[in-house]
């Protein structure tokens, strides 16, 4: 008789990424009997929660439950009911909540408390909501991309399973850009990591990894823009800010109270003779770039070398996956191709930023104006951060791979977080066993 497949024995996991600008829910699935194998966990669903990040609910915590409903209901639909009770749910909050906690620990705790109560109402195995550290965010992003790229697998393959795969087991570095922070994580060349805060040691699948990581709080793209505006308004002669990072003809009124709301602008805060100012775009990449470079203090370094603001950064090594906003922004600008050189990216940014706002609105009619207006800044910021901040060069640009998904799973910290919390990355290489005879009958 013909073999008949048994019902699949699978497990699920849910991770909510509570970022500074929005929350996303990810559902992961894997074969139960292959938990310790590398590369078996994959993403089956992403649900973007409508609305801002959870830190914005500080004055309306009672709305958090409703905010999370749609995506949690979607998880209920996707995951078979029989699996609900054994499906773990984790929520990790990142830099938006780190900033809120800096302002008020009490307010941050209140938000998390309501989030926990809301998530506990679902039939899943809720495991808690917490603010993850910048170091964790960097480390889990690094684990995610290398897990998905098959870098932890000891088996040498004659075929390539992923487009970015090189023929060796050298890990990829991870470059993550969010709204409020940015992380850089990689294995440096046989070099000591001079600052203990930036050093991580992992043993994964029987191999030791000495990893460098740093998270730059306030250097996510949204907070960097607030920093730049706060810096530039200091020297404005009146309530008009002629800004090279916005398209010619673009106009927007900004409340000074909003500008100084974030801890990220505290260093630029001053008493201004107006409550509001108007941004008037002049669309000049070179000037925008120059203004952004002023956010990076490169004059002080207590180590053999630094990124910026006195933070140790070893010499760059190997290939890097650049994901999250690095990818979303560059994808919008059509600059993710491996063939696009740093020089070409700069040229394209010059042309893009110089395009009149009315023209841009017509060309991208389907894109929300709030996002559309900021691509010139964001693209220029990415170039500035990579070149000035992290010391990539025209030569090493080809080692940056802008990645959205790998094998259908989003690049980001959430998968690595779940793999760690469910103990699915063993320290030692699992013994290879023959296929279970119970797979088919």
């Amino acid at each position: 008789t013909q073999n008949k497949a048994l019902p699949e024995n699978v497990k699920y996991g849910i991770v909510l990424d509570a970022g500074s600008s929005h929350t996303s829910l990810y559902i992961y699935k894997w074969p139960a009997e292959k938990e310790n194998d590398t590369g078996v966990v994959h993403q089956v669903e992403e649900c973007r929660v409508k609305g801002p990040g959870i830190s914005k609910f500080v004055q309306k915590v009672n709305e958090i439950g409703i905010y999370l409903t749609d995506c949690m209901e979607r998880a209920r639909e996707v995951i078979p009911r029989s699996q609900h009770q054994e499906t773990p749910v984790y929520l990790g909050a990142t830099a938006g909540m780190r900033l809120l906690r800096m302002e008020s620990e009490e307010l941050a705790d209140r938000v998390l408390d309501v989030v926990e109560r809301s998530l506990s109402n679902y039939p899943f195995d809720f495991q808690g909501a917490r603010i993850i550290t910048g170091q964790e965010e960097g480390a889990y992003g690094w684990i995610t991309i290398n897990y998905l790229l098959g870098k932890f697998s000891q088996k040498t393959r004659w075929f390539s399973i992923v487009p970015y795969e090189t023929n060796n087991q050298e890990t990829f570095g991870a470059l993550d850009l969010g709204g409020a922070s940015t992380q850089v994580t990689f294995v440096p060349q046989n070099q000591t990591i001079e600052s203990p805060d930036n050093a991580l040691q992992f043993r994964l699948y029987g191999k030791d990894y000495n990893v460098y990581t740093h998270s730059f709080l306030c250097y996510g793209k949204d907070q960097a823009l607030w920093q730049k505006l706060a810096k530039d308004i200091q020297v404005a002669s009146n309530e008009i800010l002629r800004d090279p990072c916005f398209h010619p003809g673009y106009k927007k009124v900004v409340n000074v109270s909003d500008l100084y709301k974030t801890p990220c602008t505290k260093r630029f805060e001053m008493t201004l003779p107006f409550q509001q100012f108007e941004i008037q775009g002049i669309g000049n990449y070179q000037q925008c770039h120059q203004s952004i470079l002023e956010l990076f203090n490169t004059s002080y370094c207590p180590y053999s070398q630094c990124a910026f603001n006195g933070i140790f950064l070893p010499p760059l090594q190997g290939d890097f996956g650049a994901f999250s906003a690095f990818y979303f922004v560059m994808k919008f600008l059509n600059l993710t191709s491996e063939k696009v050189s740093q020089e070409k990216v700069t040229e394209m940014m010059k042309k893009f930023c110089a395009q009149p706002w009315e023209e841009i609105k017509t060309s991208y009619a389907g894109v929300k104006e709030k996002y559309l207006s900021e691509y010139c800044f964001s693209g220029t910021y990415i170039l500035s951060l990579l070149l000035q901040g992290y010391h990539f060069t025209a030569d090493s640009w080809e080692h940056i791979h802008f990645i959205g998904k790998i094998q259908g799973s989003d690049a980001g910290w959430t998968l690595g977080y779940m793999l760690n919390l469910t103990n699915m990355i063993p320290a030692e290489q699992p013994l290879s066993t023959p296929l279970s005879h119970s797979t088919y009958v």
Epitope: N190, Q305, G318, H391, T393, D395, H399
Partner: antibody
Framework: SVKEAGGRLVTPGGSLTLTCTVS????????ISWVRQAPGKGLEWIGI??????TYYANWAKGRFTISKTSSTTVDLKMTSLTTEDTAAYFC???????????????WGPGTLVTVSS | ALVMTQTPSSVSAAVGGTVTINCQAS??????LAWYQQKPGQRPQLLIY???TLASGVPSRFKGSASGTEYTLTISGVQCDDAATYYC????????????FGGGTEVVVT
């Protein structure tokens, strides 16, 4: 450390291969550059091979000079169609980083002399 | 093509004096600039990298600075041992260039 070898007298139009042997570090983690210096003149960059194997050359060196990794500890510089203008001390140098030369060259060989003359 | 213009080609200084050497990049090189010292018959030695970071074992009288695309090496309290030729080198872009090094500056100590 790095050390060059293979320099000698060659006739115009001839070819020559120089070898840079490294010790104490891995070529999978650092770039190696070739630089030359004609008698009484300044330093002239020829090209570089990065840890990935990617090579770059000075415009004037393209086509006539080839840099390649020949083993885990050696990098060769192959020179063809040599002229008297190519007479110089040839140095190999290690880049502080594996994927860029933005941090400079921190380890240089003593140089090997190539003389092109009939 | 990216060009490094180094000035002056030669400079003389008295012991204890100050020497300033400039290097102008034809485009932004994001502080990917190194300075080397070379004495006659010797190999070059790295002095400064990333425009202003002193290499290991280099005396603090050597100082590198940057302003836009202009880079400066300053030697304060010049000593006899500083008599050498100094070179700047950009490490930002290796494509479409003739030389990553500047032309060199000979420092004569009197």
């Amino acid at each position: 450390s790095v050390k060059e070898a293979g320099g000698r007298l060659v006739t115009p139009g001839g070819s020559l291969t120089l070898t840079c042997t490294v010790s104490g570090f891995s070529l999978s983690a650092y770039g190696i550059s070739w630089v030359r210096q004609a008698p009484g003149k300044g330093l002239e960059w020829i090209g570089i091979i990065y840890s990935s194997g990617r090579t770059y050359y000075a415009n004037w060196a393209k086509g006539r000079f080839t840099i390649s990794k020949t083993s885990s500890t050696t990098v060769d510089l192959k020179m063809t169609s040599l002229t008297t203008e190519d007479t110089a001390a040839y140095f190999c140098a290690r880049s502080r980083a594996g994927i860029s030369s933005g941090d400079g060259f921190d380890s240089w060989g003593p140089g090997t002399l190539v003389t092109v003359s009939s | 093509a990216l060009v490094m213009t180094q000035t002056p080609s030669s400079v003389s200084a008295a012991v204890g004096g100050t020497v300033t050497i400039n290097c102008q990049a034809s485009q932004n090189i994001y502080s990917n600039l190194a300075w080397y010292q070379q004495k006659p018959g010797q190999r070059p030695q790295l002095l400064i990298y990333r425009a202003s970071t002193l290499a290991s074992g280099v005396p603090s009288r050597f100082k590198g600075s940057a302003s836009g695309t202009e880079y400066t090496l300053t030697i304060s309290g010049v000593q006899c041992d500083d008599a050498a030729t100094y070179y700047c080198q950009q490490g930002f872009d290796s494509s479409n260039i003739d030389n990553t090094f500047g032309g060199g500056t000979e420092v004569v100590v009197t």
